[in-house]
């Protein structure tokens, strides 16, 4: 057999479909790899050939298009299952060829089972709704092309095991599910079941998505730096460890990149000839507002370091802010007096770091250690 441009296994398209449901799978060649569409290829005399490799097998086999009731068929660049079976799982290849040209790509297809509450290994798309924002809708996804517009399917929406009926603020409206006003209690998995007739048979399409209720843009504010602040002074003696936390609150903003960074004397810590460690932790509220903490640490601070300017900066789509930490060299107390309030700098640091933990509650911490020399 002559050479064929083999695009390999396209694992980016990890296609998952439910057992015993129709599935229409487009050949990825025309979607991602070739600069022309199926119609152009077909009119140029190219033929689309399908074959597959079963799960846990190495043998490539032709697809059997002569099954009862045309269970598997091909229509233009689409491979149809009406319906799928569990053992249809495998790697499928579509090959476009004529006597002088050949191009092919393989992709994995996984047929998955669901339980009576629609739980399954299926990866779920996430749809974000703004909290208390007014009417918002989600739409039953990926049902185009399964039935003609003349067919009127029945659509039933579920939240987990339960049909959505008589809900306070959620109304099924055909392919759409309307949230009159979204609350945290609306977080969860929503399933639409689309039932339609075809050639005297009834088919079901099940689509589940995760709804996540997030902070509303109405309530969004620029980043808020909680620490450093004017109430805490970082007073250190040379040789001690200097720890300064920068704790920043970010309102949830769709597709916003939240950034926190330190500057020392106006430069990035990388560009300063001192041994600085920055540890970052991130936690999220239930509405995906974010608290980022970057703790700047100098293990053995020098008197020069204590004269430097330490500024925490934060940026989001809502704006940029900065706050300087008040850092001082501790003046040793006279030998003959009892040590007074001047000795509480270390406690302040500990209290400040502790406060971060309290503020973040049960949040997840991701620690990144950046050593700057």
């Amino acid at each position: 057999s002559e050479r064929c441009d083999d695009w390999g296994l396209d694992t980016m398209r990890q296609i998952q479909v439910f057992e015993d449901e129709p599935a229409r799978i487009k050949c990825p060649l025309f979607e991602h790899f070739l600069k022309f569409n199926y119609s152009t290829a077909h009119s140029a005399g190219l033929t689309l050939i399908w074959y597959w490799t079963r799960q846990d097998r190495d043998l490539e086999e032709p697809i059997n298009f002569r099954l009862p009731e045309n269970r598997i068929s091909k229509e233009k660049d689409v491979l149809w299952f009406r319906p799928t079976l569990l053992n249809d799982t495998g790697n499928y290849t579509c090959m476009l060829r004529n006597t002088t040209y050949c191009s092919k790509v393989a992709f994995p297809l996984e047929v998955v089972q669901k339980d009576s509450c629609f739980n399954s290994p299926m990866k779920l798309p996430v749809h974000k709704l703004y909290i208390e924002y007014g009417i918002q809708r989600i739409t039953c996804p990926n049902v185009d092309g399964y039935f003609p517009s003349s067919v009127k399917p029945t659509i039933t929406w579920y939240m987990g095991c339960y049909k959505i009926q008589n809900f306070n603020n959620v109304i099924p409206e055909g392919m759409n599910l309307s949230f009159l006003i979204a609350f945290i209690s609306n977080n969860g998995n929503y399933t639409c079941v689309v039932t339609y007739p075809e050639n005297g048979r009834t088919f079901h399409l099940t689509r589940t998505l995760t709804v996540k209720v997030v902070g509303s843009p109405k309530n969004a504010v620029p980043p808020v730096i909680h620490s450093p602040n004017d109430h805490v002074v970082y007073e250190k003696e040379p040789g001690e460890e200097l720890l300064i936390p920068c704790t920043v609150y970010f309102s949830f903003l769709m597709d916003s990149r939240n950034e926190v960074w330190w500057t020392i004397d106006g430069k990035k810590p990388d560009d300063i000839p001192i041994d600085v460690t920055i540890n970052e932790s991130i936690s999220h509220s239930r509405t995906e507002d974010e608290t980022r903490t970057q703790i700047l640490s100098i293990k053995k601070v020098t008197s020069e370091d204590l004269k430097r300017s330490y500024v925490c900066h934060a940026r989001s789509a809502k704006g940029e802010v900065a706050k300087a930490a008040t850092v001082k060299q501790k003046v040793p107390a006279p030998r003959y007096t009892v040590e007074g309030g001047g000795g509480t700098g270390g406690l302040n640091d500990i209290f400040e770091a502790q406060k971060i933990e309290w503020h973040e509650g049960g949040g997840h911490h991701h620690h990144h250690h950046h050593h700057h020399h």
Partner: antibody
């Protein structure tokens, strides 16, 4: 520890209504459903309906449609089952039950109330 | 609605013996079946769900099997506290329905 505590026994006349309460303690953060099941003396279990207190969703078994009303007061974590037009065959122990989430059908009757005996007699 | 039929209605077993209870569904319920135990004057208690998964705190002597329309609850060695009524319940289709129960009594 999640518990369901139901109201006390009731004696009712035929044609009247009864309202049984079910108070939940230690409620989970996410939505859950409260189920109502009844058991006539010496008989099996019969599902009546459910409510999802935080979302308001409810449904009733066909047999009880028009006679049963299930409600909930989220502020007190209490669900109520009201049965109207009572007849002698409604004499039964009425149970509430619940699970931890809306997503695990097998455990929707995970925790049960102690039951409320309703006697319908003239 | 799916009708659940349990057999036998009463099962007489000696302590230490094995008890096998059956439950049949009028149509396939896949593995969406639960078993409950009820003692006199008490609320039912969840034993098994998903046809074979033991609920929290349920002893290993209780086991469930089956799928589709035929299910079995087995108590490998009956203890005195196991004498009770056992119900199966399907949750594959609404309305969720219970069997009429099997009473396990001391022989």
């Amino acid at each position: 520890q999640v518990q369901l505590v139901q109201s006390g026994a009731e004696v009712k006349k035929p044609g009247s209504s009864v309202k049984v309460s079910c108070k939940a303690s230690g409620s989970p953060a996410e939505p859950y459903a409260i189920q109502w099941v009844r058991q006539a003396p010496g008989q099996g279990l019969e599902w009546m309906g459910y409510i999802i207190p935080s979302l308001g969703g409810y449904d009733y078994a066909q047999k009880f449609q028009g006679r049963v009303t299930i409600t909930a007061d989220e502020s007190t974590s209490t669900a109520y089952m009201e049965l109207s037009s009572l007849r002698s065959e409604d004499t039964a122990v009425y149970y509430c039950a619940r699970g931890q989430t809306l997503y695990d059908a097998g455990r929707q009757f995970d925790i049960w109330g102690q039951g409320t005996l309703v006697t319908v007699s003239s | 609605e799916i009708v659940m039929t349990q057999s036998p209605a009463t099962l007489s077993v000696s302590p230490g013996e094995r008890a096998t209870l059956s439950c049949r569904a009028s149509q396939s319920v896949s593995s969406n079946l639960a078993w409950y135990q009820q003692k006199p004057g008490q609320a039912p208690r969840l034993l098994i769900y998903g046809a074979s998964t033991r609920a929290t705190g349920i002893p290993a002597r209780f086991s469930g099997s089956g799928s589709g329309t035929e299910f079995t609850l087995t108590i490998s060695s009956l203890q005195s506290e196991d004498f009770a009524v056992y119900y199966c319940q399907q949750y594959n289709n609404w309305p969720w329905t219970f069997g009429q129960g099997t009473k396990v009594e001391i022989k």
